[in-house]
């Protein structure tokens, strides 16, 4: 259960994180499982442990094997296993499947390719990016922080992308490469200014005091994958989380794709045990994307229970 596969290339840096987490103050001991031999913590060693991280600087094929990490919490010793495989460098350009990280998909509007595992390393920008072993050049390609952005993505942009960066450890530099496939979704999407389907502008919603009430904010943003789109509720111009009323919570609904292909989002505002003071609040349904923000305001009014005697 607490086991993780890690892989790397010989003569490159490889850093592996213990599959068990813990507070920074917890001691973590590492062992080579086959021999139960403790991994040293001294940085002068080529392979050494540094808290939750196991560092191969650089890695060798003979380092392959299962490593055990034990996180010593105040109560239990929690055990994890890192299954490490170090491969020989390929002479040709093809990256074998066993060296590939998870495939990512993109579209014309959303084409970020993250460099896998980079957050484990001490690296400085810029990253180098390659596609099918060729260095990426041209204004369409932008290396930004830990990801690559491709402008105006086309079907031909699909392929294997490799990021290359330098890990620095105590003044020594080590190369790291990581490869993942990128696929292009064939969709002619578009985004438009948000359209709020519900609630209607300045809607008055009838509620019963003491009962629960739900308000749904529903908006559509265009067709296909949306780069940035969100719906949320505000109370008197304040985010729900900051408003500090535990009875009133928002709960994300399902992304909805209607038959006409529109990309829509719902956000349900749940009010438990409606109180008189809730009627005084202004409830704003906000929908926003790259085009801008649209707001519909709702107010609550008391629903009078039906008087059967009148």
């Amino acid at each position: 259960k607490f086991s993780k596969q890690s892989w790397g290339l010989e003569n490159e840096a490889l850093i592996v994180r213990c599959p068990r987490q813990g507070k920074p103050s917890y001691t973590v001991d590492w062992y080579y499982s086959q021999t139960n031999k403790s991994i040293p913590t001294q940085e002068r060693n080529r392979v050494f442990a540094s808290g939750q991280l196991l560092k191969f600087l650089p890695a060798a094929v003979a380092d392959s094997g299962i490593y055990t990490c034990i996180v010593r919490s105040p109560t239990f010793n929690r055990t994890g296993y890192a299954n490490v495989t170090i491969y020989k460098k390929q002479s040709d350009c093809n990256v074998p499947d066993y060296l590939m990280y998870s495939t990512v998909s993109g579209s014309e509007k959303n084409s970020k390719i993250y460099c896998p595992t980079i957050d484990l390393y001490n690296w400085t920008a810029p990253l180098e990016w390659f596609k099918n072993c060729q260095a990426l050049q041209g204004s369409r390609y932008r290396a930004h922080k830990s990801f690559l952005v491709i402008d105006n993505v086309m079907t031909e942009d699909a392929g294997d992308y490799t990021c290359k960066f330098i890990h620095n450890e105590n003044g020594a530099n080590y190369s790291v490469t990581a490869t993942r496939s990128f696929t292009v979704k064939d969709e002619q999407g578009f985004s438009l200014f948000p359209v709020i389907g519900a609630p209607a502008q300045n809607e008055i919603k009838e509620v019963e005091i003491g009962k629960n009430a739900n308000l749904t904010c529903s908006a559509c943003f265009g067709k296909g994958t949306q780069f940035l789109a969100a719906v949320l509720w505000q109370l008197n111009g304040t985010k729900i989380t900051d408003f500090g009323e535990p009875r009133i919570q928002q709960e994300e609904g399902q992304n909805q794709s209607f038959s006409n292909g529109l990309a829509c989002l719902d956000m349900v505002l749940r009010i438990a045990d409606v109180k008189e003071e809730d009627l005084l609040l202004q409830y704003d349904c906000l929908a926003l994307n790259l085009h801008g923000l649209r707001r519909h305001t709702v107010r609550l009014s008391r629903k009078n229970p039906i008087d059967h005697h009148s």
Partner: antibody, heavy 121, light 106 residues
Framework: QVQLVQSGAEVKKPGASVKVSCKAS????????LHWVRQAPGQGLEWMGT????????VYNQKFKARVTMTRDTSTSTVYMELSSLRSEDTAVYYC??????????????WGQGTLVTVSS | EIVLTQSPATLSLSPGERATLSCSVS?????MHWYQQKPGQAPRLLIY???KLASGIPARFSGSGSGTDFTLTISSLEPEDFAVYYC?????????FGGGTKVEIK
């Protein structure tokens, strides 16, 4: 959602034993350690120990080590706390509790409703 | 074992006032957790890891401190905040709680 449901109130005589159960639901039972905390009437909270449902391993507060036994039944996602050689000062509400994220020990985010154990002759 | 001492034992305040609860530790700890308990109810986690707000807890609650001195602050007391508050350490076994601070209406 995460739920910890405990067994009902118990009345025991001094010297007897009591076994309180805590049935977990809404998450993978073996992924989270479960703890027992007790509270005597009008008093504060006292940690008794914890069990790892995956392995059955336990860690007890030294104060209770000779008298407490924590066990689990993975088939019913239930943990048990048995306290023996009861005395009147063991009269308390016994709670089972769970952290929000196991590995970070980030406080008891989930609690059972409590089980009142009364020890009286 | 690590001993947690809460002060004051009782705090008498009015709604709207600021409440400052202290927890002093017998030996240094890395983190502190805080709970609220009302009569007949199980405790509720308010603050974890010294200063992080637990899920669903209003922003008027905040935590601070380090080493041997920790503080829970309620910026403006609401009627529902009158309860008993406990600090708890998870630095070493046995896990221990403070004796509690009762916040009562003045």
């Amino acid at each position: 959602q995460v739920q910890l449901v405990q067994s009902g109130a118990e009345v025991k005589k001094p010297g007897a034993s009591v076994k309180v159960s805590c049935k977990a639901s809404g998450y993978t039972f073996t992924d989270y350690e479960l703890h027992w905390v007790r509270q005597a009437p009008g008093q504060g909270l006292e940690w008794m120990g914890t069990i790892d449902p995956e392995t059955g391993d336990t860690v007890y507060n030294q104060k209770f080590k000779a008298r407490v036994t924590m066990t689990r039944d993975t088939s019913t996602s239930t943990v048990y706390m048995e306290l023996s050689s009861l005395r009147s000062e063991d009269t308390a509400v016994y709670y089972c509790a769970r952290a929000f994220y196991n590995d970070y020990d980030d406080g008891f985010a989930y609690w059972g409703q409590g089980t009142l154990v009364t020890v009286s002759s | 074992e690590i001993v947690l001492t809460q002060s004051p034992a009782t705090l008498s305040l009015s709604p709207g006032e600021r409440a400052t609860l202290s927890c002093s530790v017998s030996s240094s700890v890395s983190y502190m957790h805080w709970y609220q308990q009302k009569p007949g109810q199980a405790p509720r986690l308010l603050i974890y890891d010294t200063s992080k707000l637990a899920s669903g807890i209003p922003a008027r609650f905040s935590g601070s401190g380090s080493g041997t001195d920790f503080t829970l602050t309620i910026s403006s007391l609401e009627p529902e905040d009158f309860a008993v508050y406990y600090c708890q350490q998870w630095n070493s076994s046995p896990l221990t709680f403070g004796g509690g601070t009762k916040v009562e209406i003045k």
